[in-house]
């Protein structure tokens, strides 16, 4: 995941927010599986 | 960076449009979508990251969906309106340095 | 959403001129520098010129500066050529990126 060639501070931010929003995906859909299972 | 999918659709229709590229792996990019209605400016439409997350304009209102493969890009439209007749642009990073020419779609009964 | 106003078109130049558009936000962008600047001529897509308020994007001429901070920020041309005759448009990158938008374009004539 390089995201690109650009190093300031907006496109760090993006691409924090979108490591978030990614993890918080997955971990999210690992819960609901956990719940499922159980 | 080349997009395709554009044409002429009633109001309603559903419509898909692709972004690929020649020359440059665009998985290691985010990309966006601008659109431009004929005579007017650019709409930022919407972006999606390497890792496949999504924002939004404000206006977009779920009408569209952006996705990606490994090779492509693309802008799923729905409920389109007369309003949303315009060249539709991808364009790499989020600060949008690399355009394709554009598509053109147009929404007419 | 965020409001992007511009100079209101079109801006007219001389050959070898200055020119100066301004853009206002509604709102303070991201860091206070999340602005960027393109460059549009007819039937061709935009072009990148400026980024992060005041950086140039690769290849562009040294002739085009970006400045300002917050919600106010400003594209100087300096030593007009015939070939800057274009529409220019801010884009705003916002902590929110739903407010993200382009200011509504200057046409630049060059005399």
């Known amino acids: 995941h390089s995201d690109g060639i650009f190093t300031d501070s907006y496109s760090r931010y993006r691409k924090q927010m979108a490591v978030k929003k990614y993890l918080a995906a997955v971990l999210g859909k690992r819960y609901k599986q956990r719940v499922k299972n159980k | 960076v080349e997009e395709s999918g554009g044409r002429l659709v009633t109001p309603g229709t559903p419509l898909t449009l692709t972004c690929t590229a020649s020359?440059?792996?665009?998985?290691?990019?985010?990309m966006g979508w601008v659109r431009q209605a004929p005579g007017k400016g650019l709409e930022w439409i919407g972006d999606?990251?390497?890792?496949?997350t999504t924002d939004y304009a404000s206006w977009v209102n779920g009408r569209f969906t952006i996705s990606r493969t490994s090779t492509t890009v693309t802008l799923k439209m729905t409920s389109l309106t007369t309003e949303d007749t315009a060249t539709y642009f991808c364009?790499?990073?989020?600060?949008?340095?690399?355009w394709g020419p554009g598509t053109l779609v147009t929404v007419s009964s | 959403a965020a409001v992007l106003t511009q100079t209101p078109s079109p801006v007219s130049a001389a050959v070898g001129g200055t020119v100066t558009i301004k853009c206002q936000s509604s709102?303070?962008?991201?860091?206070?520098?999340?602005l960027a600047w393109y460059q549009q001529k007819p039937g061709q897509p935009p072009k990148l010129l400026i980024y992060?308020?005041?950086t140039l994007a690769s290849g562009v001429p040294s002739r085009f500066k970006g400045s300002g901070s917050g919600t106010q920020f400003t594209l100087t041309i300096n030593g007009v050529q015939c070939d800057d005759a274009a529409t220019y448009y801010c884009?705003?990158?916002?902590?929110?990126?739903?407010?993200?938008?382009f200011g509504g374009g200057t046409e630049v004539v060059v005399k």
């Open positions: 364009a790499r990073d989020y600060w949008l340095s690399l």
């Open positions: 020359g440059i792996d665009l998985s290691g990019y985010a």
């Open positions: 992060a308020a005041s």
């Open positions: 709102q303070s962008v991201y860091d206070n520098n999340a």
């Open positions: 884009l705003g990158g916002y902590d929110d990126p739903a407010d993200n938008a």
């Open positions: 999606i990251s390497t890792y496949g």
